[in-house]
Interface confidence: medium
């Protein structure tokens, strides 16, 4: 399929002008390459009529132009003074020859329609209202007034002043006079449908003294606006149907042969194919609304229509707006996982791509909610506090210059299942949708922290260990302290790295973190995790409580914040605290010797405290063993 896109059918009348917009993929080569407009001949040859290289054919001389708009990735062909000879098949395209990338366009130029003398032409869109003006002389002021529609030689009455209304115009046509006017009456026809188009005659009086006016009504199908979007990007349909339908239910539907299937409406209907990737936003109180669809797929291409009706469904005779969406498969947006799987108690690391040209843009992550119109409250962002209920288990890691950021969510529960969006406040095309599926865990987590009930005592030394399996042997291990603006990596000791690389003893793979001496501000959530370069992997979280040791008082933990992930009964918590003291007694003295060596090597004493927030992987690896 060619990535060039334009209007398939263009129609106009003699003497008028047309403007044809063709879209091309946004690449530097395309922006600079030759653009052309050619006419398809019967022999298969396409004769150039105008090109961006400056060529202009004789038959287009003085009446056509081709303008490139590189900032929009479009070029526009303007043709004036149309004649019926311009009817035919054309191509708009890119390339040094006319066999390059192109889109077929059919142009039809028809004759100016001939009407009886003094015919007033009314042009209205489907669903709108027309007011036909009918003038008469004073002599017919008290005579019967009527409007009829020409069908061949006959003229069938639509409405008259005796209150007759043709059934097909019932509740749509009214005949009235304004104020004190004695020489004019009006007929309103609302909810116009295509079959209303035609020649109407309005009449006051009967016989030869009757006053007659001719009116030609043209009912226009909405001209679809062309939308050119990349695969995996997003599209916004901006719908403005007017104040008259401000209070009616709104919908967006997709045309399917004769029908238009509703994708979303304000009454809560939503097509399952768009679950998790669609939002309907009212724009104001005048009936304007927009529909945003993310994660565009090839099959999303097609004709769309928005409308309003109390049923929330397409209804003939109600105003609509139309679009034709083209999905360019030569996308600049990288292919990322659309489904991420996790298990209860575990974690997920979700990679969110963004436009690399906008590395300074603000990054966000939101949870799509299936209320009637869809909404997506932000859970975390580069300048947004982590939302309630996600403290200690959600963080966003920006990797400037890489064109991606990572969101980590741990302590997973089945309630976390659902759809999430990666957003930036910059290029809105780069909105990606991820479905998170959380299943019940069937085995122990890969990362385990001991002690599980962590209470540190102010002024003392406190060490916490993270056990990891051999499969993480070659990966970088880290500890970080979680805060509302991320998880800052700390210095830690990887004891597993001391082992021979030939064998891996599952029981001795430990990365530990020491708080020395413990301070009140050390209290909070800590994460143990693994990563390879900029690629984050599994994490686990633990809440470290900090208390003052009062002389002679037993060491009892406060309510265990870690129970959220572990659900440990109180008796176990007590036992853990005893084991924790035992662990302290049996700490490997080499750890402390290693710490002293590092300090003597010139590191600041403060940096050796875990809460010193080294703030980067470098800080951690500096004191890993």
């Amino acid at each position: 399929q060619s990535p060039i896109f334009g209007p398939q059918d263009v129609s106009s009348i003699e003497g008028n002008s047309v403007s044809i917009t063709c879209y091309y993929p946004d690449t530097s080569v395309n922006r600079h390459t030759r653009k052309y407009w050619c006419r398809q001949g019967a022999n298969g040859y396409c004769a150039t009529l105008i090109s961006s290289n400056g060529y202009l054919s004789k038959e287009y001389s003085g009446r056509a132009s081709l303008i490139n708009f590189p900032e929009n990735s479009t070029f526009v062909i303007n043709i004036a003074h149309l004649t019926q000879e311009d009817t035919g098949s054309y191509k708009c395209g890119l390339g040094t020859t006319n066999r390059g990338l192109f889109f077929d366009v059919s142009l039809e130029v028809s004759q100016v329609p001939e009407f009886p003398n003094d015919t007033h032409v009314y042009t209205k869109d489907i669903g709108r209202t027309v007011t036909i003006e009918c003038r008469f002389k004073e002599g017919n002021a008290h005579s019967k007034k009527s409007l009829c529609k020409k069908r061949g030689e006959a003229c069938e009455v639509v409405i008259d002043s005796t209150e007759y209304v043709d059934p097909s115009y019932k509740d749509r046509a009214i005949l009235f006079m304004k104020g004190t006017s004695r020489d004019i009456f009006y007929v309103n026809i609302s909810h116009l449908i295509p079959s209303d188009a035609g020649l109407y005659v309005c009449q006051a009086g009967e016989g030869p003294s009757a006053d007659k006016n001719n009116a030609d009504l043209q009912v226009l199908e909405p001209e679809p606006e062309l939308l050119y979007k990349d695969l995996r990007s997003s599209v916004t349909f901006e719908c403005d149907l007017g104040r008259e339908v401000a209070n009616d239910a709104k919908y967006l539907c997709r045309k399917n042969k004769e029908t238009c299937d509703v994708i979303i409406n304000t009454l809560g209907k939503r097509d399952p194919a768009f679950e998790g990737r669609i939002l309907l936003t009212p724009r104001d109180d005048n009936g304007r609304f927009s529909v945003l669809i993310t994660g565009l797929r090839k099959e999303d291409a097609g004709h769309y229509q928005c409308g309003a009706h109390s049923s929330g469904l397409p209804q003939e005779g109600w105003p609509v707006q139309a679009w034709q969406l083209f999905v360019n498969e030569e996308s600049t947006i990288p292919n990322s996982r659309s489904v991420v799987k996790g298990v209860t108690g575990g974690s997920v690391a979700i990679v969110c791509p963004y436009n690399p040209k906008e590395s300074s843009s603000l990054k966000y992550w939101c949870h799509w909610e299936a209320d009637e119109n869809g909404r997506c409250p932000v859970l975390v962002g580069t300048q947004a506090l982590v939302q309630e209920g996600y403290e200690g288990r959600l963080a966003l890691f920006d990797q400037p210059g890489s064109g991606a950021y990572t969101v980590i969510l741990n302590q997973l529960t089945t309630q976390d299942s659902g759809f999430y969006w990666c957003l930036t406040d910059g290029d809105s095309r780069w909105r990606t949708t991820i479905e998170l599926q959380v299943a019940e865990a069937t085995k122990k987590p890969d990362l385990e922290v001991t002690p599980q009930n962590a209470t540190a005592v102010i002024g003392e030394t406190f060490t916490i260990s993270c056990h990891y399996p051999c499969k993480f042997y070659s990966q970088e291990k880290y500890w970080c302290k979680w805060s509302n603006d991320g998880c800052h990596i700390l210095p830690s000791h990887d004891e597993g790295a001391r082992q021979s690389s030939v064998s891996c003893d599952q029981s001795s793979q430990i990365v530990s973190m020491t708080l020395n001496p413990v301070k009140k501000e050390d209290e909070g959530w800590y994460w143990c995790g693994v990563k390879e370069g900029q690629v984050y992997g599994e994490t686990t979280a633990i809440y470290v409580a900090v208390e003052e040791r009062t002389r002679g008082s037993p060491h009892i933990n406060p309510t265990d914040a870690n129970a959220r992930a572990k659900d440990a009964p109180e008796e176990e918590a007590m036992e853990s605290s005893v084991r924790e003291d035992e662990n302290k007694a049996n700490l490997d003295p080499r750890l402390f010797a290693d710490e002293r060596e590092i300090q003597n090597a010139g590191d600041q004493a403060q940096e050796n405290r875990a809460s010193g927030n080294a703030g980067s992987a470098g800080g951690q690896s500096g004191s890993s063993k």
Partner: nanobody, 121 residues
């Protein structure tokens, strides 16, 4: 959820100048276009100037060359510098912004309460 607050209006003589400011606040995720509109007594509200997110600016013919719109994205603020004011510029000036909030990333129009500009000798 989103508030727009205008300031800087007042009474000025023909040929004088004023600078209007409008600050957006609330749970803002992103702002697309910021614009100034005005409404004179008995007339329709009309747009005066638009500052698009990408940096481009647009002006109504009646103010071209006299008014300058600018915006500070970091402060979510838009300004309108009005020079060589004429009596025809007398109107209530309204700030408009297309804002996506932290709850709803789709864009929606928000309006300020308006600030009165009177040009009279």
């Amino acid at each position: 959820q989103v508030q727009l607050v205008e300031s800087g209006g007042g009474l000025v003589q023909p040929g004088g100048r004023l600078r209007l400011s409008c600050a957006a606040s609330g749970s803002i995720f992103s702002i697309r276009d910021m614009a100034w509109y005005r409404q004179a007594p008995g007339k329709q509200r009309e747009w005066v100037a638009i500052a698009a997110r990408g940096g481009s600016t647009h002006y109504a013919d009646s103010v071209k060359g006299r008014f300058t719109i600018s915006r500070d994205n970091a402060k979510n603020t838009v300004y309108l510098q009005m020079n060589t004011l004429e009596p025809e510029d007398t109107a209530a000036y309204y700030c408009n912004a297309e804002v996506a909030t932290m709850i709803q990333p789709g864009f929606r129009d928000y309006w300020g309460q308006g600030t009165q500009v009177t040009v009279s000798s």
